[in-house]
C-alpha cells in the first residue's frame, strides 16, 4: 500500500546502556466511535487527545504493523523478522534497546472497511542511541517501585536531572491512556495504591532548527510492601519423621514462604547428615509456586531414586535463608512396618 | 470526615461572570482531583472540567472551552470554578466532586460531592 | 463525546421489587462506569464505581454488571429510601458524560 499519505511522527529513544529498558509505540489512529479509521482531527498539532483510541485491550480493532526497510526494499511484516518486538494489538513493544531499532515502522487497520481507510496509516520515525554516560550519573531508572500506603513519585529517566523549573511539558501516559492533568517531569503520588502499578510512558517535544522530535521514555512502575522483617518460614515437610518403603523411589518436598524483599535472593538447598559427615545434595531447581503482594512460596524437592538401609540412618535437612536470617527443618526416614 | 463545602447562591445578569468557589475538608487536598459537574432546572447531570489541585493543570469539557476557568487555592485548600458570558441557559445548581481515587489514575468516580450552588442568570 | 442512554427513563416500582436500569455506552468503555444516586434538592452519591464494585457505605442490594458497551443497575429489593433518580457516568475518556437519568417512582 501507498505509505505517503501516513501522518508521520518522529520519535528519540536515548537509551541507557546501564540498565535494561523496553520502548512503546503507539499507534495513533483516530477515534474508533468515528464510522471509519481515519478522519481529519479536530486538534491542533500543540493539542493533545484526550486518551490513546483503542487502550482497552478486549475492544481494539486489530492494527498491523510494518517496518519500512532503509534501502527502499517493500515493507516487512513486523512479526515475521522481529522475534524482539512484539504487537501488542495497537501498540508495539521493543524488548531490547540498540542502534538497530532505528527505522520506519508504519501501522494501519488490518480491516479496511472502505477506501477511504486504505490511507489511514501512521508512520513513526524512530532514531534510537545510546544516552552519554556525561549527560547525567543519577537519573531515573526504567524500573521504579511504589512502597504501598506510603509517598513516592515517578520520574521520567530521559528528564530526571533537570530540576521542576527548567523541565519542558511532559506529556505522561498509563497503560497506554494519557494522564491529561499531569505534565512535570515527576508524578508525585501522595498515597500509593496498587492501581498506581502499571507501563508509564513519557514524553517531551525536543526541537532543533530543522525539526522537532519526541522524547519518550518508559517506566515499569510495581507497587511493593515494604521488606520483611522475618526470616523465611519452612510450610513442609512438618513432621520431623517419614514413612518410607524400601527399595521404592522417594521424592521429599521443601517448600518455604519468603517474604517480600526488594533485593530478593532467597537461598533453599538440601542437606544430608550422616554422623560426622554433612553435604549439600544436587536436587532439581527451586521453583516459585505462589507469588503475592506480600511473599513468595519456594519448592525445592529431593529424590531419591531408592530408598535403602542407608538412608534410614541420614537425616535430610531443608535449609532456607533470606537476608534476616535463616531456617531449617530435619526429617528422618523410618521404614514402613 | 471528608466534607465539600461551596459558596452560597448567586443571582447574575446575562454576560456577567460568576465564580464559585469549593473548600475541601478531611483529606489531603493536593492528593485527588476535583470534578465540576452542573445540572440545569429538571434536567441531567452535566461535566464541566477537572482540576488537578497539585499542579493547577484542567482538562475542561469542549462546550465550555474559552468560558470556564477552574484555579486553586492550596493554602485554604480551595477550588474555583469561574464561568464568564453568562446566559441563561447557565442557570443550573453547580457541584464541586472529588475524584475518588489517588492521583494519578484513570477516573474513577465522584465519591464526594459539594452541597451545590445555585446560580440564576435572569436579566 | 461518548453518548450515555439509560433506559427507561423512568419506572413506577413498589417496595420489595427488583429493579434494573440499562446503560448503554455509544462506543466500548470498557469497565468505566459508574452509577449514582440522587434525590430531590440533594448532590449526587456514587454507589458503583468501575461498572460491578460497590462504594463502601451502599447497601449490598445495589449491584451493577456489564462492560463494553452494555450495563446494568440492579436493586434487588427497592426499599422505601430507593425512590430516586438514578445516572449512569462514563469514566473512560474526558468529556466524562452522564446518562440521561432514570427516575425510580413508587407505584
Known amino acids: 500500500f501507498n505509505i505517503s499519505g501516513c501522518s508521520t511522527k518522529k520519535l528519540l529513544w536515548a537509551y541507557s546502556t546501564r540498565s535494561e529498558e523496553e520502548f512503546i509505540l503507539f499507534c495513533d489512529l483516530p477515534e474508533p466511535q468515528k464510522s471509519h479509521f481515519c478522519h481529519r482531527s479536530q486538534l491542533s498539532p500543540t493539542q493533545v487527545p484526550d486518551h490513546l483510541p483503542f487502550t482497552d485491550s478486549k475492544d481494539l480493532p486489530d492494527v498491523q504493523w510494518y517496518r519500512q526497510p532503509s534501502n527502499g526494499d517493500p515493507l516487512e511484516d513486523i512479526r515475521k523478522s522481529y522475534p524482539h518486538i512484539i504487537q501488542d494489538k495497537c501498540t508495539l513493544r521493543f524488548l531490547t534497546p540498540g542502534v538497530n531499532n532505528t527505522g520506519s515502522y508504519i501501522c494501519r487497520p488490518k480491516m479496511i472497511k472502505s477506501p477511504y481507510d486504505v490511507a489511514c496509516c501512521v508512520k513513526m520515525i524512530l532514531e534510537v542511541k545510546p544516552q552519554s554516560n556525561a549527560s547525567c550519573e543519577n537519573s531515573a531508572s526504567h524500573k521504579q517501585d511504589l512502597l504501598l500506603g506510603s509517598t513516592g513519585s515517578i520520574s521520567c529517566p530521559s528528564l530526571s536531572c533537570q530540576s521542576d523549573a527548567q523541565s519542558p511539558e511532559v506529556t505522561w501516559y498509563k497503560n497506554g491512556k494519557l494522564l491529561s492533568m499531569t505534565r512535570s517531569n515527576r508524578i508525585v503520588v501522595d498515597e500509593v495504591y496498587i492501581y498506581h502499578q502499571g507501563t508509564y510512558v513519557c514524553d517531551y517535544t525536543q526541537s532543533d532548527t530543522a525539526s522537532s522530535w519526541t522524547v519518550r521514555a518508559v517506566v515499569q512502575v510495581r507497587t511493593i510492601v515494604g521488606d520483611t522483617k522475618l526470616k523465611p518460614d519452612i510450610l513442609d515437610p512438618v513432621e520431623s519423621t517419614l514413612e518410607v518403603e524400601l527399595g521404592k523411589p522417594l521424592t521429599i518436598s521443601c517448600k518455604a514462604r519468603f517474604g517480600f524483599e526488594r533485593v530478593f535472593n532467597p537461598v533453599m538447598k538440601w542437606y544430608i547428615k550422616d554422623a560426622d559427615l554433612e553435604w549439600e545434595v544436587s536436587v532439581p531447581e527451586a521453583k516459585s509456586i505462589k507469588s503475592t503482594l506480600k511473599d513468595e512460596i519456594i519448592e525445592r524437592n529431593i529424590i531419591l531414586e531408592k530408598v535403602t538401609q542407608r538412608d534410614l540412618r541420614r537425616t535430610f535437612v531443608c535449609f532456607v535463608q533470606n537476608s534476616i536470617g535463616n531456617t531449617t527443618q530435619s526429617v528422618q526416614l523410618k521404614e514402613k512396618r | 470526615q471528608v466534607q465539600l463545602v461551596q459558596s452560597g447562591a448567586e443571582v447574575k445578569k446575562p454576560g456577567a461572570s460568576v465564580k464559585v468557589s469549593c473548600k475541601a475538608s478531611?483529606?489531603?487536598?493536593?492528593?485527588?482531583?476535583m470534578h465540576w459537574v452542573r445540572q440545569a432546572p429538571g434536567q441531567g447531570l452535566e461535566w464541566m472540567g477537572i482540576i488537578n489541585p497539585r499542579g493547577g493543570y484542567t482538562t475542561y469539557a469542549q462546550k465550555f472551552q474559552g468560558r470556564v476557568t477552574m484555579t486553586r487555592d492550596t493554602s485554604t485548600s480551595t477550588v474555583y470554578m469561574e464561568l464568564s458570558s453568562l446566559r441563561s441557559e447557565d442557570t443550573a445548581v453547580y457541584y464541586c466532586?472529588?475524584?475518588?481515587?489517588?492521583?494519578?489514575?484513570?477516573?474513577?468516580?465522584?465519591?464526594?460531592w459539594g452541597q451545590g450552588t445555585t446560580v440564576t442568570v435572569s436579566s | 463525546d461518548i453518548q450515555m442512554t439509560q433506559s427507561p427513563s423512568s419506572l413506577s416500582a413498589s417496595v420489595g421489587d427488583r429493579v434494573t436500569i440499562t446503560c448503554r455506552a455509544s462506543q466500548s468503555i470498557s469497565s468505566y462506569l459508574n452509577w449514582y444516586q440522587q434525590k430531590p434538592g440533594k448532590a449526587p452519591k456514587l454507589l458503583i464505581y468501575d461498572a460491578s464494585s460497590l462504594q463502601s457505605g451502599v447497601p449490598s442490594r445495589f449491584s451493577g454488571s456489564g462492560s463494553g458497551t452494555d450495563f446494568t443497575l440492579t436493586i434487588s429489593s427497592l426499599q422505601p429510601e430507593d425512590f430516586a433518580t438514578y445516572y449512569c457516568?462514563?469514566?473512560?475518556?474526558?468529556?466524562?458524560?452522564f446518562g440521561g437519568g432514570t427516575k425510580v417512582e413508587i407505584k
Open positions: 466532586a472529588k475524584e475518588g481515587r489517588v492521583s494519578p489514575t484513570d477516573y474513577y468516580g465522584m465519591d464526594v
Open positions: 478531611g483529606y489531603t487536598f493536593t492528593s485527588y482531583y
Open positions: 457516568q462514563q469514566s473512560y475518556s474526558t468529556p466524562l458524560t
